[in-house]
Protein backbone atom coordinates (compact mmCIF):
# COMPACT_ATOMS: atom_id res chain seq x y z
CA UNK A 1 0.00 0.00 0.00
CA UNK A 2 0.93 3.64 -0.31
CA UNK A 3 2.31 5.60 2.64
CA UNK A 4 0.08 8.24 4.21
CA UNK A 5 2.02 11.50 4.30
CA UNK A 6 -0.70 13.94 5.35
CA UNK A 7 -3.87 13.73 7.41
CA UNK A 8 -7.30 13.20 5.83
CA UNK A 9 -9.72 16.11 5.66
CA UNK A 10 -11.26 16.92 9.08
CA UNK A 11 -8.49 15.09 10.91
CA UNK A 12 -5.99 16.92 13.15
CA UNK A 13 -2.25 16.31 12.87
CA UNK A 14 -0.09 16.09 15.97
CA UNK A 15 3.40 14.60 16.35
CA UNK A 16 3.20 12.47 13.18
CA UNK A 17 -0.24 11.10 13.98
CA UNK A 18 -3.70 12.08 12.74
CA UNK A 19 -6.70 12.33 15.06
CA UNK A 20 -10.42 12.46 14.42
CA UNK A 21 -12.76 13.56 17.20
CA UNK A 22 -16.35 12.36 17.10
CA UNK A 23 -19.26 14.60 18.04
CA UNK A 24 -21.74 11.78 18.54
CA UNK A 25 -21.74 8.71 20.75
CA UNK A 26 -21.31 4.98 20.10
CA UNK A 27 -20.69 1.85 22.12
CA UNK A 28 -16.99 1.00 22.39
CA UNK A 29 -17.14 -1.86 19.86
CA UNK A 30 -18.95 0.32 17.32
CA UNK A 31 -16.45 3.13 17.85
CA UNK A 32 -13.60 0.64 17.46
CA UNK A 33 -15.12 -0.61 14.21
CA UNK A 34 -15.65 2.95 12.93
CA UNK A 35 -11.96 3.72 13.36
CA UNK A 36 -10.91 0.47 11.70
CA UNK A 37 -13.07 1.26 8.67
CA UNK A 38 -11.16 4.57 8.46
CA UNK A 39 -7.87 2.61 8.40
CA UNK A 40 -7.23 3.87 11.94
CA UNK A 41 -7.72 2.74 15.53
CA UNK A 42 -9.20 4.14 18.74
CA UNK A 43 -6.68 6.53 20.26
CA UNK A 44 -3.72 5.01 22.07
CA UNK A 45 -2.21 7.37 24.65
CA UNK A 46 1.52 6.81 24.95
CA UNK A 47 2.80 10.02 26.55
CA UNK A 48 2.13 13.05 28.73
CA UNK A 49 2.04 15.24 25.61
CA UNK A 50 -0.47 13.05 23.78
CA UNK A 51 -2.73 12.97 26.85
CA UNK A 52 -2.66 16.78 26.99
CA UNK A 53 -3.32 17.14 23.27
CA UNK A 54 -6.32 14.80 23.27
CA UNK A 55 -7.66 16.25 26.52
CA UNK A 56 -7.67 19.76 25.04
CA UNK A 57 -9.64 18.64 21.99
CA UNK A 58 -12.29 16.53 23.68
CA UNK A 59 -13.05 18.88 26.57
CA UNK A 60 -14.86 17.68 29.72
CA UNK A 61 -16.75 14.87 27.97
CA UNK A 62 -16.64 11.09 28.46
CA UNK A 63 -14.76 9.75 25.44
CA UNK A 64 -13.65 6.23 24.51
CA UNK A 65 -10.00 5.36 23.95
CA UNK A 66 -8.40 2.23 22.54
CA UNK A 67 -7.88 0.45 25.87
CA UNK A 68 -9.90 -2.52 27.13
CA UNK A 69 -9.68 -5.67 29.24
CA UNK A 70 -12.46 -7.67 27.62
CA UNK A 71 -10.17 -10.70 27.34
CA UNK A 72 -8.56 -10.47 30.77
CA UNK A 73 -5.57 -8.11 31.01
CA UNK A 74 -5.70 -4.48 29.92
CA UNK A 75 -4.65 -4.11 26.29
CA UNK A 76 -4.15 -1.26 23.84
CA UNK A 77 -5.80 -1.91 20.48
CA UNK A 78 -2.58 -1.32 18.51
CA UNK A 79 -0.50 -3.70 20.64
CA UNK A 80 1.31 -1.00 22.66
CA UNK A 81 2.42 -2.57 25.94
CA UNK A 82 0.06 -1.56 28.72
CA UNK A 83 2.15 -2.51 31.74
CA UNK A 84 5.17 -0.39 30.86
CA UNK A 85 3.28 2.44 29.17
CA UNK A 86 1.69 5.73 30.17
CA UNK A 87 -1.33 5.49 32.47
CA UNK A 88 -3.66 8.18 33.76
CA UNK A 89 -6.39 6.45 35.76
CA UNK A 90 -8.58 8.33 38.18
CA UNK A 91 -7.99 7.41 41.83
CA UNK A 92 -9.54 4.02 42.70
CA UNK A 93 -9.80 3.13 39.01
CA UNK A 94 -10.01 0.81 37.17
CA UNK A 95 -12.44 -0.97 39.49
CA UNK A 96 -14.44 -3.31 37.20
CA UNK A 97 -17.59 -2.16 39.00
CA UNK A 98 -20.58 -4.50 38.85
CA UNK A 99 -23.02 -2.25 40.69
CA UNK A 100 -24.40 -0.52 37.59
CA UNK A 101 -26.98 -3.28 37.08
CA UNK A 102 -26.26 -3.62 33.36
CA UNK A 103 -24.69 -7.05 33.65
CA UNK A 104 -20.98 -7.83 33.88
CA UNK A 105 -18.28 -5.45 34.97
CA UNK A 106 -16.48 -2.58 33.24
CA UNK A 107 -14.08 -3.54 30.47
CA UNK A 108 -13.51 -0.42 28.37
CA UNK A 109 -11.54 2.73 29.22
CA UNK A 110 -12.61 6.31 28.59
CA UNK A 111 -11.44 9.84 29.31
CA UNK A 112 -13.51 11.46 32.05
CA UNK A 113 -14.42 15.12 32.45
CA UNK A 114 -10.99 15.99 33.88
CA UNK A 115 -9.04 13.93 31.35
CA UNK A 116 -8.18 11.10 33.71
CA UNK A 117 -9.28 7.58 32.81
CA UNK A 118 -12.08 5.37 34.07
CA UNK A 119 -13.28 1.91 33.14
CA UNK A 120 -16.94 1.63 32.19
CA UNK A 121 -19.55 -0.60 30.60
CA UNK A 122 -18.53 -0.99 26.96
CA UNK A 123 -22.11 -0.51 25.75
CA UNK A 124 -22.34 3.10 26.89
CA UNK A 125 -22.70 5.52 23.96
CA UNK A 126 -19.67 7.78 24.49
CA UNK A 127 -17.82 9.95 22.02
CA UNK A 128 -14.57 8.53 20.68
CA UNK A 129 -11.26 9.48 19.10
CA UNK A 130 -9.64 7.73 16.13
CA UNK A 131 -5.90 7.85 15.54
CA UNK A 132 -3.72 6.82 12.62
CA UNK A 133 0.00 7.22 12.19
CA UNK A 134 1.54 9.16 9.33
CA UNK A 135 4.18 7.33 7.27
CA UNK A 136 2.22 4.14 7.90
CA UNK A 137 1.42 2.01 4.86
CA UNK A 138 -2.28 2.45 4.12
CA UNK A 139 -4.52 -0.56 3.54
CA UNK A 140 -5.84 0.80 0.27
CA UNK A 141 -4.66 -1.09 -2.84
CA UNK A 142 -2.35 0.97 -5.07
CA UNK A 143 -3.91 2.65 -8.09
CA UNK A 144 -2.99 0.84 -11.33
Amino acid sequence: GSERTCCPVNWVEHERSCYWFSRSGKAWADADNYCRLEDAHLVVVTSWEEQKFVQRHIGPVNTWMGLHDQNGPWKWVDGTDYETGFKNWRPEQPDDWYGHGLGGGEDCAHFTDDGRWNDDVCQRPYRWVCETELDKASQEPPLL
Epitope: W48, K52, F53, R56, K87, N88, W89, P91, D114, G115
Partner: antibody, heavy 118, light 107 residues
Amino acid sequence: QVQLVESGGGVVQPGRSLRLSCAASGFTFSSFGMHWVRQAPGKGLEWVAIIWHDGSNKYYADSVKGRFTISRDNSNNTLYLQMSSLRAEDTAVYYCARDLSMGGMDVWGQGTTVTVSS
Amino acid sequence: DIQMTQSPSSLSASVGDRVTIACRASQNIISYLNWYQQKPGKAPKFLIYTASSLQSGVPSRFSGSGSGTDFTLTISSLQPEDFAIYYCQQTYSTPLTFGGGTKVEIK
Protein backbone atom coordinates in the same frame (compact mmCIF):
# COMPACT_ATOMS: atom_id res chain seq x y z
CA GLN B 1 -6.57 22.47 56.73
CA VAL B 2 -4.60 21.30 53.70
CA GLN B 3 -0.92 21.24 54.60
CA LEU B 4 2.42 19.99 53.29
CA VAL B 5 5.49 19.94 55.53
CA GLU B 6 8.95 19.15 54.16
CA SER B 7 11.84 17.81 56.22
CA GLY B 8 15.22 16.18 55.78
CA GLY B 9 17.22 19.11 54.46
CA GLY B 10 20.67 19.98 55.72
CA VAL B 11 24.32 20.39 54.80
CA VAL B 12 25.86 17.52 52.86
CA GLN B 13 29.15 16.96 51.06
CA PRO B 14 29.33 16.59 47.27
CA GLY B 15 28.79 13.01 46.14
CA ARG B 16 26.78 12.09 49.23
CA SER B 17 23.08 11.25 49.53
CA LEU B 18 20.08 12.76 51.30
CA ARG B 19 16.40 11.86 51.56
CA LEU B 20 13.74 14.54 51.79
CA SER B 21 10.25 13.86 53.14
CA CYS B 22 6.98 15.68 52.70
CA ALA B 23 4.17 14.96 55.17
CA ALA B 24 0.67 15.68 53.82
CA SER B 25 -2.46 16.35 55.84
CA GLY B 26 -5.94 17.77 55.39
CA PHE B 27 -6.68 16.04 52.08
CA THR B 28 -6.85 12.56 50.56
CA PHE B 29 -3.17 12.17 49.72
CA SER B 30 -3.68 8.98 47.68
CA SER B 31 -5.88 10.88 45.21
CA PHE B 32 -3.30 13.43 44.11
CA GLY B 33 -0.09 13.46 42.15
CA MET B 34 2.80 15.21 43.86
CA HIS B 35 5.78 17.30 42.76
CA TRP B 36 9.17 18.38 43.99
CA VAL B 37 10.28 21.86 42.92
CA ARG B 38 13.50 23.60 43.93
CA GLN B 39 14.81 27.14 44.07
CA ALA B 40 18.54 27.92 44.21
CA PRO B 41 19.52 30.97 46.29
CA GLY B 42 18.46 34.14 44.50
CA LYS B 43 17.22 32.19 41.47
CA GLY B 44 13.91 31.16 39.95
CA LEU B 45 11.83 28.01 40.28
CA GLU B 46 13.01 24.71 38.81
CA TRP B 47 10.73 21.69 38.58
CA VAL B 48 12.41 18.49 39.78
CA ALA B 49 9.96 15.58 39.55
CA ILE B 50 6.35 14.39 39.62
CA ILE B 51 4.78 11.13 40.76
CA TRP B 52 1.21 10.04 39.97
CA HIS B 53 -1.28 9.44 42.78
CA ASP B 54 -0.74 5.69 42.51
CA GLY B 55 2.92 5.81 41.52
CA SER B 56 2.12 4.61 37.99
CA ASN B 57 4.08 7.41 36.29
CA LYS B 58 7.19 9.32 37.36
CA TYR B 59 8.91 12.10 35.44
CA TYR B 60 12.15 13.94 36.19
CA ALA B 61 14.03 17.04 35.14
CA ASP B 62 17.05 16.24 32.98
CA SER B 63 19.34 17.78 35.60
CA VAL B 64 18.41 15.15 38.22
CA LYS B 65 17.55 12.13 36.08
CA GLY B 66 19.46 9.05 37.25
CA ARG B 67 20.45 10.71 40.54
CA PHE B 68 17.13 11.54 42.22
CA THR B 69 14.20 9.20 42.85
CA ILE B 70 10.69 10.33 43.73
CA SER B 71 8.49 7.94 45.69
CA ARG B 72 5.51 7.94 48.00
CA ASP B 73 3.89 6.00 50.81
CA ASN B 74 0.14 6.49 50.56
CA SER B 75 -0.50 4.60 53.78
CA ASN B 76 1.58 7.19 55.66
CA ASN B 77 0.62 10.24 53.55
CA THR B 78 4.26 10.90 52.78
CA LEU B 79 6.19 11.92 49.67
CA TYR B 80 9.93 11.32 49.35
CA LEU B 81 12.86 12.53 47.28
CA GLN B 82 15.95 10.34 47.46
CA MET B 83 18.91 12.40 46.26
CA SER B 84 22.26 10.78 45.48
CA SER B 85 25.54 11.90 43.90
CA LEU B 86 24.76 15.40 45.12
CA ARG B 87 26.46 18.38 43.48
CA ALA B 88 27.01 21.99 44.51
CA GLU B 89 24.38 23.02 41.95
CA ASP B 90 21.75 20.98 43.83
CA THR B 91 21.93 23.55 46.64
CA ALA B 92 18.42 24.99 46.92
CA VAL B 93 15.22 25.23 48.87
CA TYR B 94 13.18 22.13 47.99
CA TYR B 95 9.40 22.42 47.96
CA CYS B 96 6.84 19.67 47.67
CA ALA B 97 3.60 20.61 45.94
CA ARG B 98 0.27 18.98 45.21
CA ASP B 99 -0.52 18.35 41.55
CA LEU B 100 -3.57 19.78 39.85
CA SER B 101 -4.33 18.17 36.48
CA MET B 102 -0.89 17.02 35.33
CA GLY B 103 1.42 19.89 36.07
CA GLY B 104 -0.32 22.63 38.01
CA MET B 105 0.68 23.00 41.65
CA ASP B 106 -2.09 24.26 43.85
CA VAL B 107 -0.72 23.59 47.36
CA TRP B 108 2.90 24.08 48.42
CA GLY B 109 4.94 23.28 51.50
CA GLN B 110 7.14 25.82 53.22
CA GLY B 111 10.33 24.28 51.83
CA THR B 112 13.43 22.60 53.24
CA THR B 113 16.95 23.82 52.54
CA VAL B 114 19.63 21.56 51.07
CA THR B 115 23.21 22.83 51.00
CA VAL B 116 25.83 20.80 49.14
CA SER B 117 29.26 21.95 50.21
CA SER B 118 32.61 20.50 51.13
CA ASP C 1 12.71 21.01 26.28
CA ILE C 2 10.29 23.92 26.08
CA GLN C 3 11.85 27.25 27.07
CA MET C 4 9.68 29.84 28.79
CA THR C 5 10.71 33.49 28.47
CA GLN C 6 9.16 36.21 30.61
CA SER C 7 9.29 39.94 29.99
CA PRO C 8 10.06 42.26 31.51
CA SER C 9 12.35 40.69 34.11
CA SER C 10 11.36 43.50 36.47
CA LEU C 11 9.05 46.50 36.49
CA SER C 12 8.20 49.38 38.79
CA ALA C 13 4.58 50.35 39.28
CA SER C 14 2.32 52.24 41.66
CA VAL C 15 -0.72 51.11 43.59
CA GLY C 16 -3.72 51.31 41.26
CA ASP C 17 -1.68 50.78 38.08
CA ARG C 18 -2.60 48.23 35.45
CA VAL C 19 0.29 45.78 35.09
CA THR C 20 0.92 43.36 32.24
CA ILE C 21 3.50 40.55 32.23
CA ALA C 22 4.30 38.56 29.09
CA CYS C 23 5.35 34.93 28.82
CA ARG C 24 6.48 33.29 25.59
CA ALA C 25 6.94 29.55 24.98
CA SER C 26 9.55 28.23 22.55
CA GLN C 27 6.88 26.04 20.93
CA ASN C 28 3.11 25.68 20.89
CA ILE C 29 1.82 24.70 24.34
CA ILE C 30 -1.87 25.11 23.41
CA SER C 31 -3.20 26.66 26.64
CA TYR C 32 -1.26 24.64 29.19
CA LEU C 33 0.17 27.67 30.99
CA ASN C 34 0.00 28.48 34.71
CA TRP C 35 0.93 31.59 36.69
CA TYR C 36 2.34 31.75 40.23
CA GLN C 37 3.09 34.56 42.67
CA GLN C 38 5.99 34.38 45.12
CA LYS C 39 6.84 36.73 47.94
CA PRO C 40 10.29 36.85 49.61
CA GLY C 41 10.96 33.86 51.87
CA LYS C 42 7.60 32.27 51.03
CA ALA C 43 6.43 29.39 48.88
CA PRO C 44 4.84 30.21 45.51
CA LYS C 45 1.08 30.70 45.31
CA PHE C 46 -1.02 29.30 42.45
CA LEU C 47 -2.88 32.06 40.59
CA ILE C 48 -4.06 30.96 37.15
CA TYR C 49 -4.26 27.62 35.30
CA THR C 50 -4.77 26.70 31.66
CA ALA C 51 -3.89 30.27 30.66
CA SER C 52 -7.05 32.00 31.85
CA SER C 53 -8.79 30.09 34.67
CA LEU C 54 -8.58 31.83 38.04
CA GLN C 55 -7.68 29.57 40.95
CA SER C 56 -10.22 29.58 43.77
CA GLY C 57 -9.63 32.41 46.24
CA VAL C 58 -7.52 34.53 43.89
CA PRO C 59 -8.79 38.12 43.51
CA SER C 60 -10.54 38.95 40.24
CA ARG C 61 -8.07 41.75 39.48
CA PHE C 62 -5.78 38.97 38.24
CA SER C 63 -6.49 37.63 34.77
CA GLY C 64 -4.66 35.57 32.19
CA SER C 65 -4.94 35.29 28.44
CA GLY C 66 -3.23 33.80 25.42
CA SER C 67 -2.75 30.50 23.65
CA GLY C 68 -0.14 28.81 21.51
CA THR C 69 3.13 30.53 22.35
CA ASP C 70 2.18 33.95 23.73
CA PHE C 71 0.54 34.54 27.09
CA THR C 72 -0.18 37.46 29.38
CA LEU C 73 -0.85 37.96 33.07
CA THR C 74 -2.71 41.19 33.87
CA ILE C 75 -3.28 42.84 37.24
CA SER C 76 -6.03 45.36 36.59
CA SER C 77 -5.40 47.55 39.63
CA LEU C 78 -2.21 46.84 41.54
CA GLN C 79 -2.63 46.48 45.31
CA PRO C 80 0.10 46.76 47.99
CA GLU C 81 0.02 42.98 48.54
CA ASP C 82 0.69 42.31 44.83
CA PHE C 83 4.32 43.39 44.92
CA ALA C 84 6.08 40.06 44.35
CA ILE C 85 7.75 37.89 41.72
CA TYR C 86 5.49 36.25 39.13
CA TYR C 87 6.36 33.04 37.29
CA CYS C 88 4.74 31.37 34.30
CA GLN C 89 4.95 27.59 33.89
CA GLN C 90 4.13 25.29 30.99
CA THR C 91 2.55 21.90 31.66
CA TYR C 92 2.13 20.71 28.08
CA SER C 93 5.33 18.71 28.00
CA THR C 94 7.86 17.19 30.37
CA PRO C 95 10.17 18.38 31.70
CA LEU C 96 7.85 21.03 33.11
CA THR C 97 9.49 24.44 32.84
CA PHE C 98 9.10 27.84 34.49
CA GLY C 99 9.83 31.27 33.14
CA GLY C 100 12.64 33.24 34.75
CA GLY C 101 10.24 35.39 36.75
CA THR C 102 9.09 39.02 36.69
CA LYS C 103 9.69 41.13 39.76
CA VAL C 104 6.98 43.73 40.38
CA GLU C 105 8.41 46.49 42.55
CA ILE C 106 7.02 49.67 44.09
CA LYS C 107 7.73 52.82 42.09
